[in-house]
Amino acid sequence: CKAMHVAQPAVVLASSRGIASFVCEYASPGKATEVRVTVLRQADSQVTEVCAATYMMGNELTFLDDSICTGTSSGNQVNLTIQGLRAMDTGLYICKVELMYPPPYYLGIGNGTQIYVIDPEPCPDSDF
């Protein structure tokens, strides 16, 4: 079967500092040495790319310097962290994995992780 399954948690709640982390795991049909991971956000039928990184197996993921994502990899598992989230960023975050090299190429897309972001209440001014 020429398919690659991608698993990710159904729901994640961002921290009060606007940070959300989740694991994206893929069942590789081949021995890939180069993998690309993309995080897509789906909200109101609109899809946007949040971040993407290509990495060599055994090496660290490297996102662009201005990316809101960071991550680490371990075997067929990628630990993704998205920072700077606000309530308006609540949505479905989909993990897309591509086995780039060596051939054959494989594509796998997860069902998505619903990330809920709640903006913290502003601290009331305290009287001294």
């Epitope: 079967c1 020429k2 398919a3 049909p29 790319e49 190429y105 897309i109």
Partner: antibody, heavy 118, light 106 residues
Framework: QVQLVESGGGVVQPGRSLRLSCAAS????????THWVRQAPGKGLEWVAV????????YYADSVKGRFTISRDNSKNTLYLQMNSLRAEDTAVYYC???????????WGQGTMVTVSS | EIVLTQSPGTLSLSPGERATLSCRAS?????LAWYQQKPGQAPRLLIY???SRATGIPDRFSGSGSGTDFTLTISRLEPEDFAVYYC?????????FGQGTKVEIK
């Protein structure tokens, strides 16, 4: 708006070369893999080649391997297909197509006709 | 290489009728798309992921199926729907297309 525009087609003799171009606009070209697909007169669609993102990974159909070279210049938002040792069976309309976020080919160019004939 | 076989080769129907197009894969596929092509035009993406409609595609077009058997259904044919339809798998290389089904006016 989001679009792809091919150019460079024409009539060429067997054994000769031709280079096709595909100009992208309206989207971040470097964020998408881009394919060439061809269609011989009166026939179906045949995938030809793909180049990914930064250009480091390329795949080819067996029918063109060793003869065609796909490349891209992200600074110019342009995709290329260098076709060498052309054969009569390479006669077709050549389309460039974007692999969208979900992997399917969501944007296509209008096509450019290549005729290989003596 | 995954081989996609479409049936029937030609479908003769009248406007307002329902069209059912079939695509069978030589082995199980996870990612299947459907395209529409009119004479002299480029293909247009209709369905991706076997059942998700692409942006701007009318809801009379629907896709279903999994594994090796897939179906494109046009619930009520409009005059502009008479065209050739192709299925494609895109989950692994090489990318392949079916040979196409022509939907013509009866």
């Amino acid at each position: 708006q989001v679009q792809l525009v091919e150019s460079g087609g024409g009539v060429v003799q067997p054994g000769r070369s031709l280079r096709l171009s595909c100009a992208a606009s309206g989207f971040t070209f470097s964020s998408y893999g881009t394919h060439w697909v061809r269609q011989a007169p009166g026939k179906g669609l045949e995938w030809v080649a793909v180049i990914w993102y930064d250009g480091s990974n390329k795949y080819y159909a067996d029918s063109v391997k060793g003869r065609f070279t796909i490349s891209r210049d992200n600074s110019k938002n342009t995709l290329y297909l260098q076709m060498n040792s052309l054969r009569a069976e390479d006669t077709a309309v050549y389309y460039c197509a974007r692999a969208g976020n979900w992997g399917a080919f969501d944007i296509w160019g209008q096509g450019t006709m290549v005729t290989v004939s003596s | 290489e995954i081989v996609l076989t479409q049936s029937p080769g030609t479908l003769s129907l009248s406007p307002g009728e329902r069209a059912t197009l079939s695509c069978r894969a030589s082995q199980s596929v996870s990612y299947l798309a459907w395209y529409q092509q009119k004479p002299g035009q480029a293909p247009r993406l209709l369905i991706y992921g076997a059942s998700s409609r692409a942006t701007g595609i009318p809801d009379r077009f629907s896709g279903s199926g999994s594994g090796t058997d897939f179906t494109l259904t046009i619930s009520r044919l409009e005059p502009e729907d008479f065209a050739v339809y192709y299925c494609q798998h895109y989950g692994s290389s090489p990318w392949t297309f079916g040979q196409g089904t022509k939907v013509e006016i009866k």
